[in-house]
């Protein structure tokens, strides 16, 4: 039975040209994480693998940095970065847990972070 929950940074906003940290945390399970994938819609951004460490997709290498922790830092944001981002935790023995973050990139300087929420 999958007992874990993923806590994410939730709905967040950031300024164009700035940077943002996408963060997910898996808790309430003793399943061991073997890999974390970060995806934007259907595009793979990055993988953190237990054996191989971090791999950033070549098309995002200039704007994506690994960390902090298992999170992902997006840099030089554009309005095209607005959308859904997913952290996918591959675990043993539970299986896969997925968290969702919605990022809105704003032209103005009034961007504020949204509240945290949990996805069971």
């Amino acid at each position: 039975m999958m007992t874990g929950t993923i806590e994410t940074t939730g709905n967040i906003s950031a300024e164009k040209g700035g940077s943002i940290i996408l963060q997910c945390h898996l808790s309430s399970t003793t399943a061991q994480v073997t890999q974390v994938n970060w995806e934007q819609q259907d595009q793979l951004l990055a993988i953190c693998n237990a054996d191989l460490g971090w791999h950033i997709s070549p098309s995002f290498k200039d704007r994506v940095a690994p960390g902090p922790g298992l999170g992902l830092t997006l840099q030089s944001l554009t309005v095209n970065d607005t959308g859904e981002y997913f952290c996918i935790y591959h675990t043993y023995p539970d299986g896969t847990y997925t968290g969702r973050i919605f990022l809105e990139v704003l032209e103005s300087s009034v961007a504020e972070h949204g509240a945290r929420f949990q996805i069971p």
Epitope: Q32, N49, Y92
Partner: antibody
Framework: EVQLVESGGGLVKPGGSLKLSCAAS????????MSWVRQTPEKRLEWVAY????????YYPDTVKGRFTISRDNAKNTLYLQMSSLKSEDTAIYYC????????????WGQGTTLTVSS | DIVMSQSPSSLAVSVGEKVTMTCKSS????????????LAWYQQKPGQSPKLLIY???TRESGVPDRFTGSGSGTDFTLTISSVKAEDLAVYYC?????????FGGGTKLEIK
């Protein structure tokens, strides 16, 4: 150079409490998971507590669950182990140990601090 | 809990000899999705704290001499020292990090004749 320095050990009566500390230096402390591992007088190694890099996950074996609490202060680069309801079988050398994210082996160990539980 | 059993509990060899020690787990440490064995070996010299030698059952930690070799898969693992040196006097422990609680073997004490 990675350094982990434990402190806080001593002699405690059964039922008593004690808090151990581990000062980390030479690496980005907040990027690593951490654990406490103890070595009994018979030289057996036992893992006793784990905390994730940001402190949001903690795990314990059944032998110490409910009695031990692991915590960390990433701003101070320090790991803690609060121990209560201590028993004679908790007598051991306590090591703090570093773990790389997603890798659950212990790549660096401190020199240890000794806890003796005796009346 | 996964029980880790090491043998022999102690052995004495001469400098230059080859040494093999074994570690058996009560269940498989192989994770099928990444084909990795979640097993590590540590060396503890007298008066010192343990030091990581091998992880993923066969990957040598940086700085560890190549005379140390880890092998095996599933439930049966081996640590081999190809040509023992006097400085290898130590207790060697295996550890599974496949599932909670993480557990260690009882150790193999290597003595030099």
């Amino acid at each position: 150079e990675v350094q982990l320095v434990e402190s806080g050990g001593g002699l405690v009566k059964p039922g008593g409490s004690l808090k151990l500390s581990c000062a980390a230096s030479g690496f980005a402390f907040s990027d690593y998971d951490m654990s406490w591992v103890r070595q009994t007088p018979e030289k057996r190694l036992e893992w006793v507590a784990y905390i994730s890099d940001g402190g949001y996950n903690t795990y314990y074996p059944d032998t110490v669950k409910g009695r031990f609490t692991i915590s960390r202060d990433n701003a101070k680069n320090t790991l803690y182990l609060q121990m209560s309801s201590l028993k004679s079988e908790d007598t051991a050398i306590y090591y703090c140990a570093r773990q790389i994210l997603l890798r659950y082996y212990f790549d660096y160990w401190g020199q240890g601090t000794t806890l003796t539980v005796s009346s | 809990d996964i029980v880790m059993s090491q043998s022999p509990s102690s052995l004495a060899v001469s400098v230059g000899e080859k040494v093999t020690m074994t570690c058996k787990s009560s269940q498989s440490l192989l994770y099928s999705s990444n084909q990795k064995n979640y097993l590590a070996w540590y060396q503890q010299k007298p008066g010192q704290s343990p030091k990581l030698l091998i992880y993923w059952a066969s990957t040598r930690e940086s700085g560890v001499p190549d005379r140390f070799t880890g092998s095996g898969s599933g439930t049966d693992f081996t640590l081999t020292i190809s040509s023992v040196k006097a400085e290898d006097l130590a207790v060697y422990y295996c550890q599974q990090y496949h599932s909670y609680p993480w557990t260690f073997g009882g150790g193999t004490k290597l003595e030099i004749k």
